[in-house]
């Protein structure tokens, strides 16, 4: 049909943090490049119906469904979703194509379904059908990559059994220590599954999909380095593959490497060697020890020996189940308002943990750093000196761990007051928790020095706001003080703060704040 317009259907994914429902507009947001949805004519349908490829969207993701119409003259349109009509405002782009958009912000189950777009042009009428569904991420997995030797080749294959199929990359670095951080210029990334260059200092394989990114480092003993502070330890679960690389450099080829497990040479088929000459004509040898599926009896000290280097060992521990070892007792800290301070948790875990720091129902990203002694540490410094309860939560496939911290900020009390017909109350959040005094202001005591002791009821910590304790003091009204100004004062080691309250006003009470350091 020659009258049919040329149309294009596209999906635009947005990285946004807005929240709203369907908007039929060209909504400004940070966008990724559009994805062509095809829009083929639907056969055997009454009328002209175009069908776009099905769209799968993550929960809370934001998208735009867009139709570009290359047809002469004006167009009018209407969106229909679940029998409701939605406004449609076409506009024209620089190539004079009609553009119709449907923005879906923060995708939810209720926004999934069929979106019908009816377009009327001067020449013809037609319908475009979009089917939008929520991606079922329950079936998604992201597993830590592991290594296999490539059949008949001196190369390693990196495997990650994940859904959806992950992108696998090797992350290589030839420097020592800090310069091998992910974004360092010394780091080279290769987006492939097979790696032939196995002589580098630091070799990692990473797999990433919609769930994130997981990496596995090739455990290496370098005989040219001084040994680590404590014996390196490698944990594995029963059934996982074991790979340890021993590396040594010498002035010539006249040296050999051997692996021993508890003073017994490894069996043939559990190791393979590679060697190469480096740029300065020295020889590099590497000897891999590997077990395709470890059992409990593979536990022990693996020692790499050389005829020209000091030997070094690693302790391989095979566990039935993953673990997280750390002390879970809660910890309380008291700091000054401008004191630099970080919470920290030291732990040993296998497999690697995923963790979060939480404060006031808000989660913060959690970074972990490996220490020399086989432990890892996670620090949290972003507390902005807000007192309260902070929670560290860690988990891996087999274990969970939670640790509570309380942060108290030493500061002078701040007093808030409220009053009713029968009593007056004062509240303070200073730390250390303040003590209270009530004073009566009268002709006899214009400076409010006459202390009130009757009818005073102090409650320490009657309100816990995310771990922040609030102290209060209540004065019950008596005939002796009705009509007078009274002053409540909260004091601690850092100072005193007071509020003055008039006790007989029927409506809102006037409060006079009074800070005494």
């Amino acid at each position: 049909n020659q009258d049919l317009p040329v149309i294009k259907c596209v999906l635009i994914n947005h990285k946004n943090n807005d929240s709203s429902v369907g908007k039929s507009s060209s909504y400004p947001m940070v966008s990724e490049s559009p994805e062509d949805l095809g829009c083929a004519l639907r056969p055997q349908s009454s009328g002209t119906v175009y069908e776009a490829a099905a769209v799968e969207v993550d929960v809370s993701a934001s998208i735009t469904l867009q139709v570009l119409v290359d047809a002469p003259g004006n167009i009018s349109c209407l969106w229909v979703f679940k029998h409701s009509s939605l406004n449609c405002q076409p506009h024209f782009d620089l190539q004079n194509r009609g553009v119709v958009s449907m923005v879906i912000l923060k995708m939810t189950e209720t926004q999934a379904g069929e979106y019908l777009l009816f377009i009327q042009s001067e020449a013809t009428n037609y319908t475009i059908l979009f089917t939008v569904s929520i991606r079922n991420t329950l079936l998604y997995t992201l597993r830590r990559p592991y290594f296999r030797k490539m059949e008949n080749q001196d190369a390693l294959v990196c495997i990650s059994e994940s859904v959806p199929e992950p992108i696998v990359e090797w992350v290589l670095c030839d420097s020592q220590g800090e310069s091998c951080k992910e974004e360092s210029p010394a780091v080279v990334k290769k987006e492939e599954k097979v790696l032939h260059e196995l002589f580098g200092t630091d070799i990692r394989c990473c797999a990433r999909n919609e769930l994130g990114r997981e990496c596995t480092r090739l455990f290496t003993i370098d005989l040219n380095q001084t040994p680590q502070t404590t014996l390196p330890q490698l944990f594995l679960k029963v059934g996982e593959p074991l790979w340890i690389r021993c590396k040594a450099v010498h002035v010539n080829h006249g040296f050999g490497l051997t692996w021993e497990l508890e003073n017994k040479a490894l069996e043939e088929g559990n190791y393979f060697e590679m060697s190469t000459y480096s740029t300065n004509r020295t020889m590099i040898r590497i000897l891999f020890a590997f077990v395709s599926s470890v059992a409990r009896n593979d536990t022990g000290y693996y020692t790499c020996s050389s005829s020209k280097h000091p030997s070094q060992s690693a302790l391989v521990t095979i566990v039935e189940k993953g673990f997280i070892n750390a002390t879970n007792s809660s910890e309380d800290y008291e700091i000054d308002q401008y004191e630099e301070f970080c919470f920290s948790v030291r732990f040993k875990a296998y497999p690697q943990i995923r963790c979060t720091w939480t404060f006031s129902r808000k989660s913060f990203p959690c970074e972990q750093k490996g220490l020399d002694n086989g432990y890892s540490i996670s620090k949290f410094c972003n507390h902005k000196h807000q007192p309260g309860e902070y929670i560290f939560h860690a988990e891996n496939d087999d274990a969970q761990f939670t640790k509570m911290f309380t942060l108290n900020i030493r500061r002078k009390p701040q007093v808030l007051a409220e009053a009713s017909a029968s009593q007056a109350s004062c509240f303070s959040d200073g730390y250390p928790l303040p003590s209270w005094t009530w004073k009566k202001c009268s002709d006899k005591s214009p400076n409010c020095t006459e202390e009130i002791t009757e009818g005073v009821w102090n409650r320490k910590a009657n309100r816990k706001v995310f771990g922040q304790w609030v102290s209060s003091s209540t004065l019950n009204m008596s005939e002796a003080i009705k009509g007078f100004l009274v002053k409540c004062c909260a004091y601690n080691s850092l100072g005193t703060s007071c509020e003055t309250i008039l006790l007989n006003s029927p409506g809102p009470f006037p409060f006079i704040q009074d800070n005494i350091s």
């Epitope: 040219n224 001084t226 040994p227 014996l231 005829s307 280097h309 000091p310 302790l315």
Partner: antibody
Framework: QVQLVQSGAEVKKPGASVKVSCKAS????????MHWVRQAPGQGLEWMGI????????SYAQKFQGRVTMTRDTSTSTVYMELSSLRSEDTAVYYC???????????????WGQGTTVTVSS | DIQMTQSPSSLSASVGDRVTITCQAS??????LNWYQQKPGKAPKLLIY???NKDTGVPSRFSGSGSGTDFTLTISSLQPEDFATYYC?????????FGQGTKLEIK
């Protein structure tokens, strides 16, 4: 037989540097770590650091970090320990000791040099 | 750093006596403990490595035992040449640390 022979006694002024040598013989030099340990008069033993002769990499005790440098010369099977900014408390006998490699943690010391006396005095 | 504490600091004994020196680590060091003997004006000499293994040429009267934090050096029958200072040393982690020494004197 396996032997470590150290350089002779030294007398230095405060603020100066001293470089002690330790020549190994009777074994493959690059196969064993070399430690430096010192002993002040009438005192116990104090570890200073370790060098891997096969690669030249080192690890120093915190106390000596920034003042000590350990190097090696594989052509002569010799290791060197240089201590700078000397003070009177550095007066001691300095020993080189071979790191035995039978144990899984390579910090045992199975062969010792005869010691070098360093006296720091103004 | 791991602290090593030896006891006693000094000990008087006679030839033929059975002598025991103990060494305690401030944390678990598995069996990474070495014992050395030092005579006046001489370099230390390795006696026992990894808590219980005798170095080459060490007489059978010397023995070591222990694991974790508590270790013992035993001389079953003192000989005149055994009067010296004995040091324990942990080789579990850097920095390797020594005990303060036990001086064994003739009674």
């Amino acid at each position: 037989q396996v032997q470590l022979v150290q350089s002779g006694a030294e007398v230095k002024k405060p603020g100066a540097s001293v470089k002690v040598s330790c020549k190994a013989s009777g074994y493959t030099f690059t196969r064993y770590y070399m430690h430096w340990v010192r002993q002040a008069p009438g005192q116990g033993l104090e570890w200073m650091g370790i060098i891997n002769p096969s690669g030249g990499s080192t690890s120093y005790a915190q106390k000596f970090q920034g003042r000590v440098t350990m190097t090696r010369d594989t052509s002569t099977s010799t290791v060197y320990m240089e201590l700078s900014s000397l003070r009177s408390e550095d007066t001691a006998v300095y020993y080189c000791a071979r790191g035995e490699t039978r144990s899984y943690a390579p910090y045992g010391m199975d062969v010792w040099g005869q010691g070098t006396t360093v006296t720091v005095s103004s | 750093d791991i602290q090593m504490t030896q006891s006693p600091s000094s000990l008087s004994a006679s030839v033929g006596d059975r002598v025991t020196i103990t060494c305690q680590a401030s944390q678990d060091i598995s069996n990474y403990l070495n014992w050395y003997q030092q005579k006046p004006g001489k370099a230390p000499k390795l006696l026992i490595y990894q808590a219980s293994n005798k170095d080459t040429g060490v007489p059978s009267r010397f023995s070591g035992s222990g694991s974790g934090t508590d270790f013992t050096l035993t001389i079953s029958s003192l000989q005149p040449e055994d009067f010296a200072t004995y040091y324990c040393q942990q080789s579990y982690s850097t920095p390797p640390t020594f005990g303060q020494g036990t001086k064994l004197e003739i009674k």
